[in-house]
């Protein structure tokens, strides 16, 4: 059994999250993960999910009663999601820590936007453009 | 030329982000993207970058002078990053909108944690466990 299981059960008790009523009104993450089988699609979703958990854990960093559980789970996330690669984890952490209200960060983000956009689709790297990548505009285009 | 280029140039003017001094003290996103060649690694990073831009654009949604530019860029992000797939974009949006301070959300997240963790590594789906997935702790362990 992976180390995180016991510690996650401990967190369930702490957050009173073991009751069946918690599952009312659908799931947060599991239903979404079920929708995506393609590895790169899953990574898009899991990236948001992992950053959510890291934020959640940060909010409880001063609560000693769950520190060991939180640390064990974070470590196992490092192992599983970042494949034990500290550089990958550090780069991810940098991205999640940028403040969207910081004026210098805003300027930098806009400065880099064209190059970021150019790299967004896998096709960008091969120079080929996917057939689906045309600009459709319509009633619900700007979401 | 993709539609976003002209509009991104417009945003550069608005944010005063065209000056060379903006690049001082390194990049936000470009340096990180350069580190990752593997598609699934890139998606992990790009997921955070795209959510950053969406948050940034949301903060300026009432500024009429840049609305057209913002909408065009968002559309092109939908096309490039979500491959024009509205469901993918909607699921992504749901994940980015969960509030980490909402008690019900916290309980649900902890309730789902074990299953989310079980799906985190690509190996999880095949039942194989990667050799590198071992738990080491050290000086800079709990970041």
């Amino acid at each position: 059994q992976d180390p995180y299981v016991k510690e996650a059960e401990n967190l369930k008790k702490y957050f009173n999250a073991g009751h069946s009523d918690v599952a009312d009104n659908g799931t947060l993450f599991l239903g979404i993960l079920k929708n995506w089988k393609e590895e790169s699609d899953r990574k898009i979703m899991q990236s948001q999910i992992v950053s959510f958990y890291f934020k959640l854990f940060k909010n409880f960093k001063d609560d000693q009663s769950i520190q060991k559980s939180v640390e064990t789970i974070k470590e196992d996330m490092n192992v599983k999601f970042f494949n034990s690669n500290k550089k990958k984890r550090d780069d991810f952490e940098k991205l999640t820590n940028y403040s969207v209200t910081d004026l210098n960060v805003q300027r930098k983000a806009i400065h880099e936007l064209i190059q970021v956009m150019a790299e967004l689709s896998p096709a960008a790297k091969t120079g080929k453009r996917k057939r689906s990548q045309m600009l459709f505009r319509g009633r619900r285009a700007s979401q | 030329q993709d539609p976003y280029v002209k509009e991104a140039e417009n945003l550069k003017k608005y944010f005063n982000a065209g000056h060379s001094d903006v690049a001082d003290n390194g990049t936000l996103f470009l340096g990180i993207l350069k580190n990752w060649k593997e598609e699934s690694d890139r998606k992990i990073m790009q997921s955070q970058i795209v959510s950053f831009y969406f948050k940034l654009f949301k903060n300026f949604k009432d500024d009429q002078s840049i609305q057209k530019s913002v909408e065009t860029i968002k559309e092109d992000m939908n096309v490039k990053f979500f491959n024009s797939n509205k469901k993918k974009r909607d699921d992504f949006e749901k994940l980015t909108n969960y509030s980490v301070t909402d008690l019900n959300v916290q309980r649900k997240a902890i309730h789902e944690l074990i299953q989310v963790m079980a799906e985190l590594s690509p190996a999880a789906k095949t039942g194989k466990r990667k050799r590198s997935q071992m738990l080491f702790r050290g000086r800079r362990a709990s970041q």
Epitope: - | W36, K37, K130, M134, R139
Partner: antibody
Framework: EVQLLESGGGLVQPGGSLRLSCAAS????????MSWVRQAPGKGLEWVSA????????YYADSVKGRFTISRDNSKNTLYLQMNSLRAEDTAVYYC?????????????WGRGTMVTVSS | NFMLTQPHSVSESPGKTVTISCTRS????????VHWYQQRPGSSPTTVIY?????PSGVPARFSGSIDSSSNSASLTISGLETDDEADYYC????????????FGGGTKLTVL
């Protein structure tokens, strides 16, 4: 002061066994992964094995897998390397090293090393 | 597993600048941190650069590390060379792609003329 002190090296015949120890002091031993790195005479560094802080996870280089066993006793602040079926190519200075960050990234503290000679 | 290749030896005069390269054979050099160790004759290795370009306290600013994706290599640069810098230098990275543990370069002997 943070210190690592290796012992247990010596001369052993091919096929023989030896147990190396590494006594740690000056830091919370159980909080750190530890590793063994060796250096053959006149040659470069070669990573041998590593163990997690709790001792629950171990890891080996292909060249020693099945012959060497890493272990630790956190109550004694000591790291061990049990070496069996020794070969001439295992002749080297064996360094005990502290792993500097989570997983196997860098080694921030090294011992002085203990010499192992495998010869008939 | 990938390999890390370093020049066998380099030499330079005191006060000058020297750069030691470390080239990764497969996979991207940028996808794992690179660390550098100094080993003086008869001594244990000590870290001079960790995580690509970070210096441990006590290591002078004359030592710097960098990564170049185009050549798939890392570099250790020592400026204002001192006779005391004469030593073997090793680069090291972790193989998390193929789960091969820790990889060291073959080492570079720096001679200060």
């Amino acid at each position: 002061e943070v210190q690592l002190l290796e012992s247990g090296g010596g001369l052993v015949q091919p096929g023989g066994s030896l147990r190396l120890s590494c006594a740690a002091s000056g830091f919370t031993f159980s909080s750190y992964a530890m590793s063994w790195v060796r250096q053959a005479p006149g040659k470069g560094l070669e990573w041998v094995s590593a163990i997690s802080g709790s001792g629950g996870s171990t890891y080996y280089a292909d060249s020693v897998k099945g012959r060497f066993t890493i272990s630790r006793d956190n109550s004694k602040n000591t790291l061990y390397l049990q070496m069996n079926s020794l070969r001439a190519e295992d002749t080297a200075v064996y360094y005990c090293a502290r792993v500097g960050s989570w997983y196997l990234e860098d080694f921030d503290i090294w011992g002085r090393g203990t010499m192992v000679t495998v010869s008939s | 597993n990938f390999m890390l290749t370093q020049p066998h030896s380099v030499s330079e005069s005191p006060g000058k600048t020297v750069t030691i390269s470390c080239t990764r054979s497969s996979g991207s050099i940028a996808s794992n941190y690179v660390h550098w160790y100094q080993q003086r004759p008869g001594s244990s290795p000590t870290t001079v650069i960790y995580e690509d370009n970070r210096r441990p306290s006590g290591v002078p600013a004359r030592f710097s590390g960098s990564i170049d994706s185009s050549s798939n290599s890392a570099s250790l640069t020592i400026s204002g060379l001192e006779t005391d810098d004469e030593a073997d230098y090793y680069c090291q990275s972790s193989d998390t792609t193929y789960h091969g543990g820790v990889v060291f370069g073959g080492g570079t002997k720096l001679t200060v003329l």
